[in-house]
Interface confidence: low
C-alpha cells in the first residue's frame, strides 16, 4: 500500500534540480537562482551556501548541488564540510586565543595547524636520543645506550610540565 501510494505521488517524478510546486498543481518547477535540490521528489529547494569573508568558493552552487567552500590563504578548514576556517601558524607554533605562539620547550609542531605535541621519550623504548628535538621537529631516537660505542653520549629531553590535551586532574 505504501509503495502504491508513493508511485501515485506526482512529486516523486520531480528530478534533482527541481521542486514539487504546490502552488502550481504539483508540477516540477526548476529551483530558483541560488538554490538547489540534490535529490528528487523534494517540495522545496535549499538555499545555496555562500562562501563569504574568510571562506572562498571551491565549487559553485548548481541546481543539483550545494556550493563548497574552503579557506583563504593563511587559514585552513575545520569541521565537516569546512564549517570553520582557523588561522594557520608557522611550524613550531600553535594557535591560541591570542594568535600564534611558539611551542613550549619539550614540545613541537611540524604543521601549520594543530597543537604542539610532546617530544618522543626515547628511553621508554629503551633507546637514546640521536637528534635533539626542536620546536618544529620531534627528537630522533637511535639505538639503545648499550649499543652506543664507548664515549658516545645520549641526551634525554625532559618531559613537558603539562602535555597538551591532558584531561583534568
Amino acid at each position: 500500500f505504501e509503495r502504491t501510494r508513493s508511485l501515485q505521488d506526482p512529486c516523486s517524478n520531480c528530478p534533482a534540480g527541481t521542486f514539487c510546486d504546490n502552488n502550481r498543481n504539483q508540477i516540477c518547477s526548476p529551483c530558483p537562482p541560488n538554490s538547489f535540490s540534490s535529490a528528487g521528489g523534494q517540495r522545496t529547494c535549499d538555499i545555496c551556501r555562500q562562501c563569504k569573508g574568510v571562506f572562498r568558493t571551491r565549487k559553485e552552487c548548481s541546481s543539483t548541488s550545494n556550493a563548497e567552500c574552503d579557506c583563504t590563504p593563511g587559514f585552513h578548514c575545520l569541521g565537516a564540510g569546512c564549517s570553520m576556517c582557523e588561522q594557520d601558524c608557522k611550524q613550531g607554533q600553535e594557535l591560541t586565543k591570542k594568535g600564534c605562539k611558539d611551542c613550549c620547550f619539550g614540545t613541537f609542531n611540524d604543521q601549520k595547524r594543530g597543537i604542539c605535541r610532546p617530544w618522543t621519550n626515547c628511553s621508554l623504548d629503551g633507546k637514546s636520543v640521536l637528534v635533539n628535538g626542536t620546536k618544529e621537529r620531534d627528537v630522533v631516537c637511535g639505538p639503545s645506550p648499550a649499543d652506543l660505542s664507548p664515549g658516545a653520549s645520549s641526551v634525554t629531553p625532559p618531559a613537558p610540565a603539562r602535555e597538551p590535551g591532558h584531561s583534568p586532574q
Epitope: 570553520m84 594557535l95 586565543k97 602535555e163
Partner: antibody, heavy 123, light 106 residues
C-alpha cells in the same frame, strides 16, 4: 591538591572600586600552560566570564566589561587579583576564580574553582 | 561574541528518568564545549569537556555529544544527587556560558 581561595568581597558603594584576591595552592600561576580567570554570578542568575591571565602574562577580558576590569597576579605570592571600577548595583554577584583545565589553548574549560566571594554594591 | 542558548530553561524529572539538555552556539565552535553542574551555594563542577570527554570522577551516566553549533548533555538515569543547574560553556573564542538549565524533582 589544587585549591583556590577568594577574598576581598563585601559591601561596596556605587561608583566605588573593589580588588579581589585569589590565593592559589597546589600549582604555580607561572608554570607553562597554566591560566586562571574570574567568573561571576549575580544572585539567581547564570555564570559570566570576566577575565583571564596566562602563565606568560597575556590577559583576556570580557568585551562588555573590558573598560572597567583589570586582572593581575603576584607570582611571589601565587595570588591572582581582579580590580573592578565604577561599580554599579548590577555588579552585585558572587565572584569566582577558576583554573583553566586545558593546555590545548583553543578550547578551554575550567577544572578547579574557588568557593566564591560575595560582592554587594549598594548605598 | 559567541552566544550559547540552552534549552529547556528548566525541567521536572523523576529519579531514573533519562534527561537531555541541549546547547546551541551562535556560530560553529568545533567541539570546544564544556558542561558544568552547580548546586545552590556551591561553585560549578566540571562534568564534560571537549564536548564528550567526562572529567575525572564523573559517573558514566553523564555523557556529552555534538559538534559545530549543536550539543547535548544526557543523564541516562537521573539520581537524587543530580538535581541541580547545568551550564554549557564554549572555549573556542574567549569564554561564554549558556544561561543554565535547572533540573527539578517532579
Amino acid at each position: 591538591e589544587v585549591q583556590l581561595v577568594e577574598s576581598g568581597g563585601g559591601l561596596v558603594q556605587p561608583g566605588g572600586s573593589l580588588r579581589l584576591s585569589c590565593a592559589a595552592s597546589g600549582f604555580s600561576l607561572s608554570t607553562g600552560g597554566v591560566a586562571v580567570g574570574w567568573i561571576r554570578q549575580a544572585p539567581g542568575k547564570g555564570l559570566e566570564w570576566l577575565a583571564l591571565i596566562d602563565w606568560d602574562g597575556d590577559k583576556s577580558y570580557s568585551t562588555s566589561l573590558k573598560s572597567r576590569l583589570t586582572i593581575s597576579r603576584d607570582n611571589s605570592k601565587n595570588t591572582l587579583y581582579l580590580q573592578l571600577n565604577s561599580l554599579r548595583a548590577e555588579d552585585t554577584a558572587v565572584y569566582y576564580c577558576a583554573r583553566e583545565g586545558s593546555t590545548a589553548v583553543v578550547g578551554d574549560w575550567f577544572d578547579y574553582w574557588g568557593q566564591g566571594t560575595l560582592v554587594t554594591v549598594s548605598s | 561574541d559567541i552566544q550559547l542558548t540552552q534549552s529547556p530553561s528548566s525541567l521536572s524529572a523523576s529519579v531514573g528518568d533519562r534527561v537531555t539538555i541541549t546547547c546551541r552556539a551562535s556560530q560553529g565552535i568545533s567541539r570546544y564545549l564544556a558542561w558544568y553542574q552547580q548546586k545552590p551555594g556551591k561553585a560549578p563542577k566540571l562534568l564534560i569537556y571537549d564536548a564528550s570527554n567526562r572529567a575525572t570522577g564523573i559517573p558514566s551516566r553523564f555523557s556529552g555529544s555534538g559538534s559545530g553549533t549543536d550539543f547535548t548533555l544526557t543523564i541516562s538515569s537521573l539520581q537524587p544527587e543530580d538535581f541541580a543547574t547545568y551550564y554549557c560553556q564554549q572555549g573556542y573564542s574567549l569564554w561564554t556560558f549558556g544561561q543554565g538549565t535547572k533540573v527539578e524533582i517532579k
